[in-house]
């Protein structure tokens, strides 16, 4: 969702969204200078009136956090940036239509990997988003995407991997060799919207087998 550049003052006005945190970004063109300032407006799709984003008026940085203004993940939004440089006319560029549900990317999950003697347990922690429920609770990714599931891989060596997947938050890879290092990777997938996070990676070593010492 990037607009075509026709001016040397402003280009690449687009939303960058991750886990429903929606940041408007842009680049200054070759004609922009250090005194170029930018102002941001936004609106819901279907509405006429543009709203000025407080805190993003006549700014010099090339980003603006519109998470709160675009927080309804079932709606579509537009944003536009107006660039003004000394002695020149203002240049305005608008984003393509933006939907956080469609366009947001998913960050790697937060996972705790717990080594045991012959197994490794992986606990996936729910990912909070800025999206609020009607009663003001922050929603997790699991509460937004019905089809969200986790794919876990345990690299035993260069040639062998173990796989688990599901919608649960607790997993355990069993039958491992004690006192051995393993590489785990955990990815979030949402099939309907074809989203896949980068993996969370943990390197863990199973605990040594001390039972012989007591026999």
């Amino acid at each position: 969702h990037t607009t075509v550049d026709t001016s040397g003052l402003l280009q690449h006005v687009k939303f960058q969204s991750s886990n429903f945190e929606n940041i408007l970004t842009w680049d200054g063109g070759p004609a922009s200078t250090s005194d170029t300032v930018y102002s941001v407006e936004y609106k819901k799709y279907g509405e006429r009136k543009w709203l000025a984003k407080a805190g993003c008026q006549r700014i010099t940085q090339k980003f603006c956090n519109l998470t709160m203004e675009t927080r309804n993940h079932t709606e579509f939004y537009y944003a536009k940036v107006t660039a003004v440089s000394a002695g020149g006319p203002p240049v305005t560029k608008m984003t393509d239509r933006f939907s956080s549900l469609q366009h947001t990317t998913i960050k790697p999950p937060d996972v705790t990997c717990i080594p045991k003697v012959r197994s490794i347990q992986m606990l996936v922690h729910p990912t909070l988003t800025p999206v609020l429920s009607e009663d003001g609770h922050q929603l997790t990714l699991e509460e937004i995407f019905h089809d969200l599931f986790y794919r876990l891989e345990l690299h035993v060596n260069h040639t062998y991997q173990m796989h688990l997947e599901g919608k649960q938050r607790e997993y355990e890879f069993l039958g491992l060799t004690p006192d051995t290092e393993f590489l785990g990777s955990i990815t979030i997938l949402t099939p309907i919207l074809s989203k896949e996070s980068a993996p969370y990676v943990c390197r863990v070593k199973t605990l040594p087998d001390r039972t012989w010492a007591y026999s």
Epitope: H137, I144, G166, K167
Partner: antibody, heavy 117, light 107 residues
Framework: EVQLVESGGGLVQPGGSLRLSCAAS????????MYWVRQAPGKGLEFVSV????????HYVESVKGRFTISTDNAKNTLFLQMNSLKSEDTAVYYC??????????WGQGTQVTVSS | DIQMTQSPSSLSASLGDRVTITCQAS??????LAWYQQKPGQAPKLLIY???RLQTGVPSRFSGSGSGTSFTLTISGVEAEDLATYYC?????????FGQGTKVELK
């Protein structure tokens, strides 16, 4: 202990309406995915609708879109299915079910809905 | 929608027999498949999830395998209490869809 108890089924004429309820207990109702699943006489199982009780996000199977509405009353731990413009092919046992720890493992006993003139 | 094709639709088994039921998905569902058992007048009961993982409390004579589009439920030695209808369920994307069911009867 998880319990789901459906009610509200009955005999209704084609074009009529019915509201099913499912009283839930034994788990955190206000943060769960809740389902309505139906089974026509002598037939297989079909997922009808799902709602997340916290986000309010809903999905429907194509055959009931625009006619059925799933909703919840989180204060009363109750799931609803409002069924309008009922057709004879909606005749079935309607079950509510929930996903706990990632698994759809708990079901109610079902309530019979018969659409007939 | 993802179609689940289950076979056979019914089968007759003697007690102690090894029984195999297959389920084919119209597209890849990874390992997002569950198997349910349903007896007349009762709600379905979860047996297997994640294609091959046995639900707590389910006898070990039940096992599941497969991934992608092809899945199998095996009962290693049928007991009288296993006579029921079995359904596969894809839990990959909405609408979740069941196979048509396989009725296991006594020979």
């Amino acid at each position: 202990e998880v319990q789901l108890v459906e009610s509200g089924g009955g005999l209704v004429q084609p074009g009529g309406s019915l509201r099913l309820s499912c009283a839930a207990s034994g788990f955190t109702f206000s943060s769960s995915w809740m389902y309505w699943v139906r089974q026509a006489p002598g037939k297989g199982l079909e997922f009808v609708s799902v709602i997340n009780t916290r986000s309010g996000i809903t999905h429907y199977v194509e055959s009931v879109k625009g006619r059925f509405t799933i909703s919840t009353d989180n204060a009363k731990n109750t799931l609803f299915l409002q069924m309008n413009s009922l057709k004879s092919e909606d005749t079935a046992v309607y079950y509510c079910a929930t996903r706990i720890q990632g698994l759809i493992d708990y079901w109610g006993q079902g309530t019979q809905v018969t659409v007939s003139s | 929608d993802i179609q689940m094709t289950q076979s056979p639709s019914s089968l007759s088994a003697s007690l102690g027999d090894r029984v195999t039921i297959t389920c084919q998905a119209s597209q890849s569902i990874s390992s997002q498949l569950a198997w349910y058992q349903q007896k007349p007048g009762q709600a379905p009961k979860l047996l297997i999830y994640g294609a091959s993982r046995l639900q707590t409390g389910v006898p070990s004579r039940f096992s599941g395998s497969g991934s992608g589009t092809s899945f199998t439920l095996t009962i290693s030695g049928v007991e009288a209490e296993d006579l029921a209808t079995y359904y596969c369920l894809q839990d990959y994307s909405w609408p979740l869809t069941f196979g048509q069911g396989t009725k296991v009867e006594l020979k």
